[in-house]
């Protein structure tokens, strides 16, 4: 129960990609505002997005402090223009989010093929190591810095002239594959965290083909 005309937030949902993390909820406010709090299981609550009429709150700055922690958020509802007002139990109306562990649950963003270079019958394909908002020693860490060898890339490649696809895997950001001389190949990559049971795979990268700008050829 709560103050008249104030409704509790519902459908609290974490939206997170490469650790950029936003909490979303419903409903769109009518004569009410929201404040969000976040904490770790053992930590203190920290308030964010004070008295907002938005139905989302960017919590990235909090979760990147320790991406392996499990976080809980809650959304408080207050009557607009009377934010000191509380529910009948003497507390503001609020709703808890599901628990969220960034390291285990953040979605893997769509990867990008940074470059490919052919030398004879070998092609080296390099995946861009995307920067995250996770910091260590005042520098932003890359996805590889954060996940280490937990992060795998799968390369899909095929002759431009044929439909038969092949794959290769790496726990670095580089592939070295054999190709047939004189043939053009196309490439796409996918990020995977094998140890996960949810959000294991990214979407596939855009396809890049030999004979286009990103490539380089050397005999």
């Amino acid at each position: 129960s709560g103050t008249t005309n104030t409704v509790a937030a519902y459908n609290l949902t974490w939206k997170s990609t490469n650790f950029k993390t936003i909490l979303e909820w419903e409903p769109k406010p009518v004569n009410q505002v929201y404040t969000v709090q976040i904490s770790t299981k053992s930590g203190d609550w920290k308030s964010k997005c004070f008295y907002t009429t938005d139905t989302e709150c960017d919590l990235t700055d909090e979760i990147v402090k320790d991406v392996k922690q499990t976080y809980l958020a809650r959304v408080f509802s207050y009557p607009a223009g009377n934010v000191e007002s509380t529910g009948s139990a003497g507390e503001p109306l609020y709703e808890n989010s599901p628990e969220f562990t960034p390291y285990l649950e953040t979605n893997l963003g769509q990867p990008t093929i940074q470059s490919f270079e052919q030398v004879g019958t070998k092609v080296n394909v390099t995946v861009e190591d995307e920067r995250t908002l996770v910091r260590r020693n005042n520098t932003f860490l890359s996805l590889r810095d954060v996940f280490g060898k937990d992060l795998i890339y799968t390369l899909y490649y095929w002759k431009s002239s044929s439909s038969g696809k092949k794959t290769a895997k790496t726990n670095t950001n580089e592939f070295l594959i054999d190709v047939d001389k004189g043939e053009n190949y196309c490439f796409s990559v996918q990020a995977v965290i094998p140890s996960r049971t949810v959000n294991r795979k990214s979407t596939d990268s855009p396809v890049e083909c030999m004979g286009q700008e990103k490539g380089e050829f050397r005999e």
């Epitope: 696809k165 092949k166 290769a168 790496t170 726990n171 094998p194 949810v198 596939d204």
Partner: antibody
Framework: EVQLQQSGPELVKPGASVKVSCKAS????????VYWVRQSPGKGLEWIGY????????FYDENFMGKATLTVDKSSSTAYMQLNSLTSEDSAVYYC??????????WGQGTTLTVSS | DIQMTQSPSSLSASVGDRVTITCLAT??????LAWYQQKPGKAPQLLIY???YLADGVPSRFSGSGSGTDFTFTISSLQPEDFATYYC?????????FGQGTKLEIK
């Protein structure tokens, strides 16, 4: 509990086609590729190919291109392998299995295919 | 395509023996290799993934080592239930070839 339940044994005539099913349960079907493997009588394991249930993209060993066609039905969490133009050489046990990128961790019980006139 | 050569093809040993099986690849696999056990009439069962990691529920007498092109699978002290056929599998690339298998029999 992760399970892959395959369809029962098949006895078919040469030249015919057959469709083997593999129903997955106990995990999110679209998160893991499904491998298919053949084992001929008294022989070793041969990799046929795999399908990514999320997008339907398939990969085949060259020896099975044109012989095997892999599909999925996401709504029923079921993978299928159709084998066509069957000959006695195709008589074998066919397995589906769940790919976890670093290995294949759960296997179906196998479907025995006998091709005989 | 990468080829896998597994040896020996068969092996006789006694309970309590230490047994070693090798798998050689024609190109480097880093550690993209798995080992399986198969008993007659049954599906294969994963024992080792990523060359050295023991799969869930697998006894510690099984181990894997190696990287690049040379891999070894070891059973430190054979138990009666270990008599079976063992396969290596490259998971680095497609086609995801299996070794020819090693049949482990009671001496």
């Amino acid at each position: 509990e992760v399970q892959l339940q395959q369809s029962g044994p098949e006895l078919v005539k040469p030249g015919a086609s057959v469709k083997v099913s593999c129903k997955a349960s106990g995990y999110t079907f679209t998160h893991f590729n499904v491998y298919w493997v053949r084992q001929s009588p008294g022989k070793g394991l041969e990799w046929i190919g795999y399908i990514d249930p999320d997008n339907g993209i398939t990969f085949y060993d060259e020896n099975f291109m044109g012989k095997a066609t892999l599909t999925v039905d996401k709504s029923s969490s079921t993978a299928y392998m159709q084998l066509n133009s069957l000959t006695s050489e195709d008589s074998a046990v066919y397995y589906c299995a769940r790919d976890v990128t670093t290995a294949v961790d759960f296997w179906g019980q196998g479907t025995t295919l006998t091709v005989s006139s | 395509d990468i080829q896998m050569t597994q040896s020996p093809s068969s092996l006789s040993a006694s309970v309590g023996d230490r047994v070693t099986i090798t798998c050689l690849a024609t190109q480097t696999l880093d550690t993209w290799l798995a080992w399986y056990q198969q008993k007659p009439g049954k599906a294969p069962q994963l024992l080792i993934y990523a060359a050295t990691y023991l799969a869930d529920g697998v006894p510690s007498r099984f181990s894997g080592s190696g990287s690049g092109t040379d891999f070894t699978f070891t059973i430190s002290s054979l138990q009666p239930e270990d008599f079976a056929t063992y396969y290596c599998q490259l998971v680095y690339s497609s086609p995801s070839t299996f070794g020819q298998g090693t049949k482990l029999e009671i001496k």
